[in-house]
Interface confidence: low
Amino acid sequence: RPSFSLVEDTTLEPEEPPTKYQISQPEVYVAAPGESLEVRCLLKDAAVISWTKDGVHLGPNNRTVLIGEYLQIKGATPRDSGLYACTASRTVDSETWYFMVNVTDAISSGDDEDDTDGAEDFVSENSNNKRAPYWTNTEKMEKRLHAVPAANTVKFRCPAGGNPMPTMRWLKNGKEFKQEHRIGGYKVRNQHWSLIMESVVPSDKGNYTCVVENEYGSINHTYHLDVVERSPHRPILQAGLPANASTVVGGDVEFVCKVYSDAQPHIQWIKHVEKNGSKYGPDGLPYLKVLKHSGINSSNAEVLALFNVTEADAGEYICKVSNYIGQANQSAWLTVLPKQQAPGREKEITASPDYLE
């Protein structure tokens, strides 16, 4: 449901899928549930700092402490995961730094980084002491429920001993777990008594049971895996951009829009225009003209460049960014001065591209 009318004579090529949109990912801070997390806002000369999470203002509460340039989250839960931003407001400008918080039980790679050579798990028994299987490290088995974001790697461990050395097999939902049951299969590291699944998907959800047995007995332990699909959010635009600008008649000017979006964003540059001497259509909505959008023929849609401007180019320029979740827009004003008047920038913006898409 668009909230504007497009000028009828605006010539736009048919909507094309946006070009591959390059962004540098914000820094990611990882914490396990229950841990405390402290993040320092990496902005210099910050007089006043405000914080947001997923684009919504973040205030202090019984678990969130905001002290100076520090954000502390006590007893983190998966609901604390998301895109955070701190904005430093100064007298002349403002600057925003984005970072991700990921509160998850999942290990971050397919390697057994918490294992050494596995010697502490692989117990050698004296051949005379026959013994049924037993767990050698129950601490590594305490957490039965694993909620893991999609695409992460999961490792389940059942360190055991016995004589003769027990064998280990894995069941999924009570049935034999075969390699062909999942795309990419899985790894079993017998020396580490572990099952590893890389790049989990929702169909990996279920109960995983290790069965450890020898001729004297059998023991088993069940883990529950829940695969959480990532919830994208609507685009977030860097505060203060695009910035107001002024130039003389015949001069050139650039507006810049910095976007963070974890779903494919579509950028439009829009300007209010007049039609038949009116700024508004019969429905009361303003006439808008799309000057540029991130279609296949657009280069660097984040930047709108205007060359050889005239007085008619003065006015409000809107950067509108949408993805399939929602949209965001911010605007700036262009002032066009007579040639004899020297232009002065209304805002001094020092925006680093390092932390934004």
């Epitope: 399939y324 929602g326 949209q327």
Partner: antibody, heavy 122, light 107 residues
Framework: EVQLVESGGGLVQPGRSLKLSCVAS????????MTWIRQAPGKGLEWVAS????????YYAGSVKGRITISRDNAKSTLYLQMNSLRSEDTATYYC???????????????WGQGTSVTVSS | DIQMTQSPSSLSAFLGDRVTITCRAS??????LRWFQQKPGKSPRLMIY???NLANGVPSRFSGSRSGSDYSLTINNLESEDMAIYYC?????????FGSGTKLEIK
Amino acid sequence: EVQLVESGGGLVQPGRSLKLSCVASGFRFNDFWMTWIRQAPGKGLEWVASITYTGDNTYYAGSVKGRITISRDNAKSTLYLQMNSLRSEDTATYYCTRDDYGGYSPYYMDAWGQGTSVTVSS
Amino acid sequence: DIQMTQSPSSLSAFLGDRVTITCRASQDIGNYLRWFQQKPGKSPRLMIYGATNLANGVPSRFSGSRSGSDYSLTINNLESEDMAIYYCLKHNEYPFTFGSGTKLEIK
């Protein structure tokens, strides 16, 4: 224009089955979770079931768990609700709505179908 | 499960009045709360998302606010077209729960 059109409702006897459909148009169906909501005559709204983009994960209200199955066919942009062992308390208008578990999305439940009426009676 | 207690169950007000409807959550749900309007014989319509954000096309006389576990929908300058039943919905986790509804009538 975003449109959701439900069908498949009707009069059915207790213990029997019924399958509802919801055809979506005007948006990228496989980019959204989808949800069924129902409303008994003269009563309030009740969440019934939700399904993820791919259909791999499904979620159900306790009152329908084990009797009702939500599914989707992304190629046909269609959402389904298979209702088995129907009871009189399942009598309601069933609405489908597009969903986004992301929380603050303005598109979350912003589009609803016109509803399809299910009456369970002998 | 988290309970949503909506009040009042019905409300009668004059045109031009300011009315407020409240939902109380039994546990913390953050800002994961929405408000819907349903007119007789019609499908529900999203009015407020994220506890405080106005949905597309909703008149600015509608607003949402939060104070702790209490969430409010306020209508300023009541108009005849606002006569409807209003529901809150919490959606921080499954199962999603609607409030019982508030029937708003015009005196």
